[in-house]
Amino acid sequence: ASNFDCCLGYTDRILHPKFIVGFTRQLANEGCDINAIIFHTKKKLSVCANPKQTWVKYIVRLLSKKVKNM
């Protein structure tokens, strides 16, 4: 759920890391209402996820590790 590039809510699905090519952080104090992780998928979709959820943290950690190792 996004509006003018801002997430307004969170997905209720769990995504697999293999589906995700990258992410963007949305911060509530930078013009949007909520904090969010915006996952960019291989199907060119943007998915708004809750940064507090374990599965979201796990994927962010995985992707961050990948970037570090490049």
Partner: antibody, heavy 120, light 107 residues
Amino acid sequence: QVQLVQSGAEVKKPGASVKVSCKASGYTFTNYWMHWVRQAPGQGLEWMGVIDPSDSYTTYAQKFQGRVTMTVDTSTSTVYMELSSLRSEDTAVYYCARGNYGVDYAMDYWGQGTLVTVSS
Amino acid sequence: DIQMTQSPSSLSASVGDRVTITCRASENIYGALNWYQQKPGKAPKLLIYGATNLADGVPSRFSGSGSGRQYSLTISSLQPEDFATYYCQNVLITPYTFGGGTKLEIK
């Protein structure tokens, strides 16, 4: 060693609710998801939903939305699955299964199953 | 939701045979696929995760392959204990749908 021990068989009347428990041991309970999967007699496996014991986050299959509730008691390392408004088609063996990020989100350990019979 | 179609639904084979079970997803699942074995009256057991990786304690006669929408499970030389029902499962995105199962019977 990892063990998931489920509660015993239940017989329920149509319209009633059932609550099945799954007690985990042998691992750090909050580090893994818990899934619920059911299997009607002679049928295949059907994924019902999952709960993350670390924050009680749940997501359910659309088919069970509004009828299923998964909860967790971290003090006893137990997960519960409650299914309401039971009908005869809900007669099945219900399994809890540990979800493991580390092995490609697979269900690497399963409970022994709980038979729920719905009959008038 | 992603649909998983397994074939064949049943299969008769003999000890020592090489058998292959296939699983087709309704869309690309990028290798996010697991295989389980289930014996009558027992809980399923994880065999293969991530399409190709053997789970702990699973004999090397089992192997998984595939990508995109098409996946397969191969048993290189059937043993008596392998006669069971096999299920594939999509874990790309919830709901985590299963294939309908393949029942492997003794010929």
